[in-house]
């Protein structure tokens, strides 16, 4: 599904956005240092990883999934586990690290072209030709390279995180992509639901800063799934 491509917390595997460059599938990978997790959760080491109990994938960080720690273990005892890297075995999309999805039991790289039609359809449906000058991908906002002599400040348009000043990442903000602050402890973050299709992600937050992960707010455990907030929390 589209969700396996759009991980809105890490801002690293975006489809060509309304304000971005469709001709640069690689731009999705040229994010700021430290936000790509090709090896799974970069904070999950034997020394410092504290198991986090969970009931569903949504309660874990964006680079984790919820499962029993032992093969064939008691389904009642589940914790957040590091996501599976490319070419590792999987049973569902959530098990694969952002930028990958589960295909035939193996985590494979998300092919953006494969989802282009679905994304285009969502854009047309959401924005409507009578509402704006946009027409699917035919008239994208183009950004001239001369804009990037200086690093983008908070709120300025960008194509990728490297366009933004230190402490900022490039993330979608409704109509366009802009430089936004990397999240601090306690700030609301997005744990993207990989299950089901939620359409084009039109509001994105940056990833949580160093030493933090996006987890469900403790006092929101009782709330309904749709209303629960996630915040950046210490490991």
């Amino acid at each position: 599904t589209l969700n396996s491509v759009l991980n809105s917390n890490a801002i690293k595997n975006l489809p060509p956005p309304l304000g971005g460059a469709a001709g640069h599938p690689g731009s999705a990978v040229s994010a700021a240092p430290g936000i790509l997790y090709p090896g799974g959760n970069k904070y999950q080491t034997i020394d410092n990883y504290q198991p986090y109990p969970c009931a569903e994938d949504e309660e874990c960080g964006t680079d984790e999934y919820c499962a029993s720690p032992t093969r064939g273990g008691d389904a009642g005892v589940q914790i957040c586990l590091a996501c599976r890297k490319r070419r590792k075995r999987c049973m569902r999309h959530a098990m694969c690290c952002p930028g990958n999805y589960c295909k035939n039991g193996i985590c494979v790289s998300s092919d953006q072209n494969h989802f282009r039609g679905e994304i285009e359809e969502t854009i047309t449906e959401s924005f409507g030709n009578d509402h704006s000058t946009l027409d699917g991908y035919s008239r994208r906002t183009t950004l001239s390279s001369k804009m990037y002599h200086t690093k983008g400040q908070e709120g300025s348009v960008c194509l990728r995180s490297s366009d933004c000043a230190s402490g900022l990442c490039c993330a979608r903000h409704f109509w366009s992509k802009i430089c936004k602050p990397v999240l601090k402890e306690g700030q609301v973050c997005t744990k993207h639901r990989r299950k089901g299709s939620h359409g084009l992600e039109i509001f994105q937050r940056c990833y949580c800063g160093e030493g933090l992960s996006c987890r469900i707010q403790k006092d929101h455990h009782q709330a309904s799934n749709s209303s629960r907030l996630h915040t950046c929390q210490r490991h």
Partner: antibody
Framework: QVQLVESGGGLVQPGGSLRLSCAAS????????MSWVRQAPGKGLEWVSV????????YYADSVKGRFTISRDNSKNTLYLQMNSLRAEDTAVYYC?????????WGQGTLVTVSS | DIALTQPASVSGSPGQSITISCTGT?????????VSWYQQHPGKAPKLMIY???NRPSGVSNRFSGSKSGNTASLTISGLQAEDEADYYC???????????FGGGTKLTVL
């Protein structure tokens, strides 16, 4: 510091036209989306229109669609709002706002009065 | 017109804490987990006080904080001061078409 200064407001008859301008300074104007937001006397805020940094995308509130046109001249650091077929209900203070992470900087506004 | 719902007025004494609510639907505030808050003194331009639910722009006092649960967002002002007396507006986005939407505004009176 960021500064936005609106001009062009005034009294106009119903059905008439007016062009508002917003002079921007203190930031890289060509790197930001810009919006117009209005506020009728004694009422709340109402978003009117937004334009992308390079003018390729524009959006309008349903209440002004087809009557108002937003534009910008990045070489002059200026935002415009062309208002045609004005109605009494368009009477308001019109604010120019930088649409960074939401409306993060605002001008002081210019009053548009539509009355016969 | 679609608008987020805010109480028309709230009041509090200096030093107290007050909370202003902003209620939307799953098509706007609830759907995006996103809300901003603006302060407007009489005759002045609005000022961004909170964005993305609970983030403060630089220069905004830490007495201002935001939160959200379900379709309702809240702005809390602690240690109320006389200069906090103003109108406060919440803002989010509607989904189709995508457009900013404001609450009706809340007049805060410091007694």
């Amino acid at each position: 510091q960021v500064q936005l200064v609106e001009s062009g407001g005034g009294l106009v008859q119903p059905g008439g036209s007016l062009r508002l301008s917003c002079a921007a300074s203190g930031f890289t104007f060509s790197s930001y989306w810009m919006s117009w937001v209005r506020q009728a006397p004694g009422k709340g805020l109402e978003w009117v229109s937004v334009i992308s940094s390079d003018s390729s995308s524009t959006y309008y509130a349903d209440s002004v669609k087809g009557r108002f046109t937003i534009s910008r001249d990045n070489s002059k650091n200026t935002l415009y709002l062309q208002m045609n077929s004005l109605r009494a209900e368009d009477t308001a203070v019109y604010y120019c706002a930088r649409h960074g992470i939401d409306f993060d900087h605002w001008g002081q506004g210019t009053l548009v009065t539509v009355s016969s | 017109d679609i608008a987020l719902t805010q109480p028309a007025s709230v009041s509090g004494s200096p030093g107290q804490s007050i909370t202003i609510s902003c209620t939307g639907t799953s098509s706007d505030l609830g759907g995006y987990n996103y809300v901003s808050w603006y302060q407007q003194h009489p005759g002045k331009a609005p000022k961004l006080m909170i964005y993305d639910v609970n983030n403060r722009p630089s220069g905004v006092s830490n007495r201002f904080s935001g939160s959200k649960s379900g379709n309702t967002a809240s702005l809390t002002i602690s240690g109320l001061q006389a200069e906090d007396e103003a109108d406060y507006y919440c803002q989010s986005y509607t989904y189709t078409p995508i457009s900013p939407v404001f609450g009706g505004g809340t007049k805060l009176t410091v007694l």
